[in-house]
């Protein structure tokens, strides 16, 4: 069971300092951006991290949303990352959800975060290069020190 708590506005970067944004096709991508680029591209660079209380504490449960024309929420349905046009619900009556990720700091590095799927144990949000694009994907990972599954989260509130 997940119950919605507060939310915060954040900029999410990979460890190469590329900024996560949602493109015109609703795809989550990473790109090099200056601070002014980041501001100019808002709200596509500003993510709403919705925190949830978890009935079985497993780390900080979050849903990640973005508000452009409408609110879209990150989902890993069928292990595929996409933004679905939906508001994060107030309550989720299950221990797993395609929109809930566990945000945890990398041990010994409080500023580096990993996001593990609540639906798929051992699967993490990751940045992966595909042709010329740096995409946000869901990846099964047993190398937890791999930088591709680490991110920084900068609060904008």
């Amino acid at each position: 069971y997940f119950g919605k708590l507060e939310s915060k506005l954040s900029i999410i970067r990979n460890l190469n300092d590329q900024v996560l944004f949602i493109d015109q096709g609703n795809r989550p991508l990473f790109e090099d951006m200056t601070d002014s680029d980041c501001r100019d591209n808002a709200p596509r660079t500003i993510f709403i991290i919705n925190m949830y209380k978890d009935s079985q504490p497993r780390g900080m449960a979050v849903a990640i949303s973005v508000k452009c024309e409408k609110i879209s929420t990150l989902s890993c349905e069928n292990r595929i990352i996409s933004f679905k046009e939906m508001n994060p619900p107030d309550n989720i009556k299950d221990t797993k959800s395609d929109i809930i990720f566990f945000q945890r700091s990398v041990p010994g590095h409080d500023n580096k975060m990993q996001f593990e799927s609540s639906s798929y144990e051992g699967y993490f949000l990751a940045c992966e290069k595909e042709r010329d694009l740096y995409k946000l994907i869901l990846k099964k990972k047993d190398e937890l020190g791999d930088r591709s599954i680490m991110f920084t989260v900068q609060n904008e509130d």
């Epitope: 504490p57 497993r58 780390g59 566990f102 945890r104 990398v106 041990p107 010994g108 590095h109 593990e116 144990e121 051992g122 099964k140 047993d142 190398e143 937890l144 020190g145 791999d146």
Partner: antibody, heavy 126, light 107 residues
Framework: QVQLVQSGAEVKKPGASVKVSCKVS????????FHWVRQAPGKGLEWMGR????????KYAERFKDRVTMTEDTSTDTAYMELSSLRSEDTAVYYC???????????????????WGQGTLVTVSS | DIQMTQSPSSVSASVGDRVTITCLAS??????LTWYQQKPGKAPKLLIY???KLQDGVPSRFSGSGSGTDFTLTISSLQPEDFATYYC?????????FGQGTKLEIK
């Protein structure tokens, strides 16, 4: 309690291949991997590689990648490690081990080699 | 590849002694480090994971510490059954690498 039972000792000639099996008995959750580790007589532990039973993807140590093949038969819960072009330096005890997530109090994951087979001695001698 | 340098390679000690073994990683491995105990003719046994978390059933005289590149295994008061070889293993990135081992012998 998970137990790993390996096949028996083997004696092989240089240039031959050996295939070691590792059968899981007991209840094991999903989301584990099989790793293979070897130990030459009187020496330390050496990681050889791993296989993911979910999709059969493998990762091999560079020094073995041209000679080793790791496979898994989900229907019998058995993993296999085949090493080809054997030489005398491959004389060692070969262990299979499971690689599973353990968690701390905040749910943070750590992969751990927890269950180990009893080891299989492979002797390479002409 | 990440190199794991374990020291000392051997140590002689008596029952009741406090013993410390160190492992040094060639790059940051966070706390993705495990410690194993191995006795002759037997498979390794997990003692500590996540650098400092005691595996269930392992006596509390064993403790681990460290983060980043420097790690320590401490046995606070040696018991006769502790004489064995100890290995560290980094699980941060492939290829996984073990330390060279520390043989703990009776003085």
């Amino acid at each position: 309690q998970v137990q790993l039972v390996q096949s028996g000792a083997e004696v092989k000639k240089p240039g031959a291949s050996v295939k070691v099996s590792c059968k899981v008995s007991g209840e094991i959750s999903t989301g584990y991997y099989f790793h293979w580790v070897r130990q030459a007589p009187g020496k330390g532990l050496e990681w050889m590689g791993r296989i993911d039973p979910e999709d059969d993807s493998t990762k091999y140590a560079e020094r073995f990648k041209d000679r080793v093949t790791m496979t898994e038969d989900t229907s019998t819960d058995t993993a296999y490690m085949e090493l080809s072009s054997l030489r005398s330096e491959d004389t060692a005890v070969y262990y299979c081990t499971t690689w599973r997530i353990y968690r701390d109090s905040s749910g943070r994951p750590f992969y751990v080699m927890d269950a180990w087979g009893q080891g299989t001695l492979v002797t390479v001698s002409s | 590849d990440i190199q794991m340098t374990q020291s000392p390679s051997s140590v002689s000690a008596s029952v009741g002694d406090r013993v410390t073994i160190t492992c040094l990683a060639s790059e940051d491995i966070y706390t993705y480090l495990t410690w194993y105990q191995q006795k002759p003719g037997k498979a390794p046994k997990l003692l500590i994971y996540g650098a400092n978390k005691l595996q269930d059933g392992v006596p509390s005289r064993f403790s681990g510490s460290g983060s980043g590149t420097d790690f320590t295994l401490t046995i606070s008061s040696l018991q006769p059954e502790d004489f064995a070889t100890y290995y560290c293993l980094q699980g941060s990135k492939f290829p996984l690498t073990f330390g060279q081992g520390t043989k703990l012998e009776i003085k």
